[in-house]
């Protein structure tokens, strides 16, 4: 909706300026549990190796970041909360900060494009469903247009 | 594995040259069912509007193309095959051509990056699982590294 569009645009306008604050909030939240977990980590080898940083900076950056946020929120933190009653609230707070960051990244589409759906595709699917049987004929009859669009996409990728 | 890497690199090296052939194969396959479906399509308005082409060319291009290929393969073509026994094999052949194109696009990662998984993330998850309870401490103790990586990703996005 136009309202959402405006909200999204506003998010993008102010987002770079908010970045240091959001990262500071994350670091502050982590500082409350840092000692607890780092004291218990006796292993010298890194889990988050530099190859992960390279993926974050490469063409798979969005997927890598999206997957890692999901990994921390769904796998790591729920288990981390149960390690000690004293740190449960702090881990929970850290998770909330991470969720807030993801929400802001999603709102400003260019930051997490891989988590956004194409509106045009949604419109095609909706129109197709409304047309019922006629939709099959229409979609198939326009397959040559689809091929042209694929060609445009691939030509653009080759040029880039 | 190294083998896969080489295959992927070879796909990318030869891919641009193969593009016209793949599109020609798609167009040839479509030509065998084109008349059947276009005769039955009585509607004047387009289903695949230019807004879809714009999405293909924009930052959501990969998702849009990926979703549209899936849409044709999973929703449109299975129903299109059942419209007439005489065209079933031709629609099936068109689907196979589309699957081949998708496979080649996937192999050369830069063409469909949104469908590829980050190897580094996979390695993190595997290492985490192997470490069992120690993995929780390790993943949480390295959350500051994760914040730094997020910062690097976002800084790169702002600069781009």
């Amino acid at each position: 909706s136009p309202g959402q569009g405006t909200q999204s645009e506003n998010s993008c306008t102010h987002f770079p300026g908010n970045l240091p604050n959001m990262l500071r909030d994350l670091r502050d939240a982590f500082s409350r549990v840092k000692t607890f977990f780092q004291m218990k980590d006796q292993l010298d080898n890194l889990l988050l190796k530099e190859s992960l940083l390279e993926d974050f900076k490469g063409y798979l950056g969005c997927q890598a970041l999206s997957e890692m946020i999901q990994f921390y929120l769904e796998e790591v933190m729920p288990q981390a909360e149960n390690q000690d009653p004293d740190i449960k609230a702090h881990v929970n707070s850290l998770g909330e900060n991470l969720k807030t960051l993801r929400l802001r990244l999603r709102r400003c589409h260019r930051f997490l494009p891989c988590e956004n759906k194409s509106k045009a595709v949604e419109q095609v699917k909706n129109a197709f469903n409304k047309l019922q049987e006629k939709g099959i004929y229409k979609a198939m009859s326009e397959f040559d247009i689809f091929i042209n669009y694929i060609e445009a996409y691939m030509t653009m990728k080759i040029r880039n | 594995s190294p083998g896969q890497g080489t295959q992927s690199e070879n796909s990318c090296t030869h891919f641009p040259g193969n593009l016209p052939n793949m599109l020609r194969d798609l167009r040839d396959a479509f030509s065998r069912v084109k008349t059947f479906f276009q005769m039955k399509d009585q509607l004047d308005n387009l289903l695949l509007k230019e807004s879809l082409l714009e999405d293909f060319k924009g930052y959501l291009g990969c998702q849009a193309l990926s979703e549209m290929i899936q849409f044709y393969l999973e929703e449109v073509m299975p129903q299109a095959e059942n419209q007439d026994p005489d065209i079933k094999a031709h629609v099936n052949s068109l689907g196979e051509n589309l699957k081949t194109l998708r496979l080649r696009l996937r192999r050369c990662h830069r063409f469909l990056p949104c469908e590829n998984k980050s190897k580094a993330v996979e390695q993190v998850k595997n290492a985490f699982n192997k470490l069992q309870e120690k993995g929780i401490y390790k993943a949480m103790s390295e959350f500051d590294i994760f914040i730094n990586y997020i910062e690097a990703y976002m800084t790169m996005k702002i600069r781009n």
């Epitope: 530099e50 940083l53 | 730094n148």
Partner: antibody, heavy 117, light 112 residues
Framework: EVQLVESGGGLVQPGGSLRLSCAAS????????VHWVRQSPGKGLEWLGV???????DYSAAFMSRLTISKDNSKNTVYLQMNSLRAEDTAVYFC???????????WGQGTSVTVSS | DVLMTQSPLSLPVTLGQPASISCRSS???????????LEWFQQRPGQSPRLLIY???NRFSGVPDRFSGSGSGTDFTLKISRVEAEDVGVYYC?????????FGGGTKVEIK
């Protein structure tokens, strides 16, 4: 290959300040901490301070009031700022990478600072 | 601050013979996480320091196996089983368990 390169050394007036840089290649300061260590002519090694991967710092008490260590992850560079220099600060200043197991595994070649009028 | 005291100050050795350097800390250097962060560095003439041993007894990658570390609590030792010409230089012990981190005064190894 891991490499650390210090720069910014030279002649400084007593009472002046210095800003040294430590540029890295082969690894990222987003993942590892960096230490500063100095060596006065003919003397031993003296630990000055560290900037951890998360950006927090620890300093030797002897230098706390006039030493600041900072970093720019995007440039993969760490900085050492020292104020109120005196002749005793004449030394070769080294930066060293913090390995994951709490030790300094790779060192730069050092940059020489002379405090003299 | 934790004071690290090395002995001897100078160690003249014969090529092919063993050498031993002692390092004593003014207090226990077991970190609160249970690890003992005691390292040994070698500094050849005109070069930067080079890590030899970390966490008391672990040899760093590329370090010859003639170098070994041992000890616990406050007393630590670096041993060279057979001294070679390239081993000439100053050796420093270092503790990274308690801030501020501190070096020993150094032991100069020279060939007799």
């Amino acid at each position: 290959e891991v490499q650390l390169v210090e720069s910014g050394g030279g002649l400084v007036q007593p009472g002046g300040s210095l800003r040294l840089s430590c540029a890295a290649s082969g690894f990222s300061f987003a993942t590892y901490g960096v230490h500063w260590v100095r060596q006065s002519p003919g003397k031993g090694l003296e630990w000055l301070g560290v900037i951890w991967r998360g950006g927090s710092t620890d300093y030797s008490a002897a230098f706390m009031s006039r030493l600041t260590i900072s970093k720019d992850n995007s440039k993969n560079t760490v900085y050492l700022q020292m104020n109120s220099l005196r002749a005793e600060d004449t030394a070769v200043y080294f930066c060293a990478k913090q390995a994951y197991g709490h030790y300094m595994d790779y060192w730069g070649q050092g940059t020489s600072v002379t405090v003299s009028s | 601050d934790v004071l690290m005291t090395q002995s001897p100050l100078s160690l003249p050795v014969t090529l092919g013979q063993p050498a031993s350097i002692s390092c004593r800390s003014s207090q226990n250097i077991v970190h609160s996480n249970g690890n003992t962060y005691l390292e040994w560095f070698q500094q050849r003439p005109g070069q930067s320091p080079r890590l030899l041993i970390y966490k008391v007894s672990n040899r760093f990658s590329g370090v010859p196996d003639r170098f070994s570390g041992s000890g616990s609590g406050t007393d630590f030792t670096l041993k060279i089983s057979r001294v070679e010409a390239e081993d000439v230089g100053v050796y420093y012990c270092f503790q990274g368990s308690h801030v501020p981190w501190t070096f020993g005064g150094g032991t100069k190894v020279e060939i007799k």
